[in-house]
Amino acid sequence: KHKCFRNSLENNETLESIMNTLESEEDFRKYFYYLEGSKGGGGSK
């Protein structure tokens, strides 16, 4: 359903551990919205 990808994971971090903390669609949006901006992803200026 969602097409979000990361280039790398932090220490001791797994994709499963990230997803387990995102309990709702809004959490998912908030998490990746900031990631896109801070990492220059999406359509960063």
């Epitope: 903390t21 998490y31 992803g41 960063s44």
Partner: antibody, heavy 122, light 113 residues
């Protein structure tokens, strides 16, 4: 230059329909989520609707859900708002606005159109 | 929905003096997973669309004068104009983008005393 040019406002009777357009230039349109925000005369700002860069995901305020439809044509770099069953309380300046860094979701807005006035009155 | 409440509704400040606008959200807009506040500030002059000033509560948009600053966290936020200039006369709005529907404060009108 980077800009959003709006068209399509005007006077419409209650219950009528209107389609607003927002033509984008100066940036890769499909890379950004877009929104419509309105402002009733002399009042504050109200977020109305948003759409992802691909057009796959849409979002609406409760006040317009089921009456308004947001869409985009990335081949034409144009955003649309189809407004049906219009009410007097929909009278406002409608702005299109661009998200600064996300194609998937709207958030805040770094580029705005000049606005187009929609008046719903008999 | 998250309600945004600004205070005061209007304020008059002398040129060169400090202007402070407050914004309070009905629930926290701080996301614990990244410790970021999902809050933006805009300036709107008569007959013009809004202009983005601040996002993530305290990050100044490119090209915005450094006399504009944002602070706060959780539910309480402040926009400060450190030395008011004539061109700063406008209405200022806060906006939360923590959850949909995104909501704005009612606006604060800043005038010259």
């Amino acid at each position: 230059q980077v800009q959003l040019v709006q068209s399509g406002g005007g006077l419409v009777q209650p219950g009528g329909s209107l389609r607003l357009s927002c033509a984008a230039s100066g940036f890769t349109f499909s890379n950004y989520a877009m929104s419509w925000v309105r402002q009733a005369p002399g009042k504050g700002l109200e977020w109305v609707s948003a759409i992802s860069g691909s057009g796959d995901n849409t979002y609406y305020a409760d006040s317009v859900r089921g009456r308004f439809t947001i869409s985009r044509d990335n081949s034409k770099n144009t955003l649309y708002l189809q407004m049906n069953s219009l009410r007097a309380e929909d009278t406002a300046i409608y702005y299109c606005a661009k998200d600064p860094h996300s194609s998937r979701w709207p958030g805040f807005f770094d580029l705005w159109g000049r606005g187009t006035l929609v008046t719903v009155s008999s | 929905d998250i309600q945004m409440t600004q205070s005061p509704d209007s304020l008059a400040v002398s040129l060169g003096e400090r202007a402070t606008i407050n914004c309070k959200s009905s629930q926290s807009v701080l996301y614990s997973s990244n410790n970021q506040n999902y809050l933006a500030w805009y300036q709107q002059k008569p007959g013009q669309p809004p202009k983005l000033l601040i996002y993530w509560a305290s990050t100044r948009e490119s090209g915005v004068p450094d006399r504009f600053s944002g602070s706060g966290s959780g539910t309480d936020f402040t926009l400060t104009i450190s030395s008011l200039q004539a061109e700063d006369v406008a209405v200022y709005y806060c906006q939360q983008y923590y959850s949909t529907p995104y909501t704005f404060g009612q606006g604060t009108k800043v005038e010259i005393k």
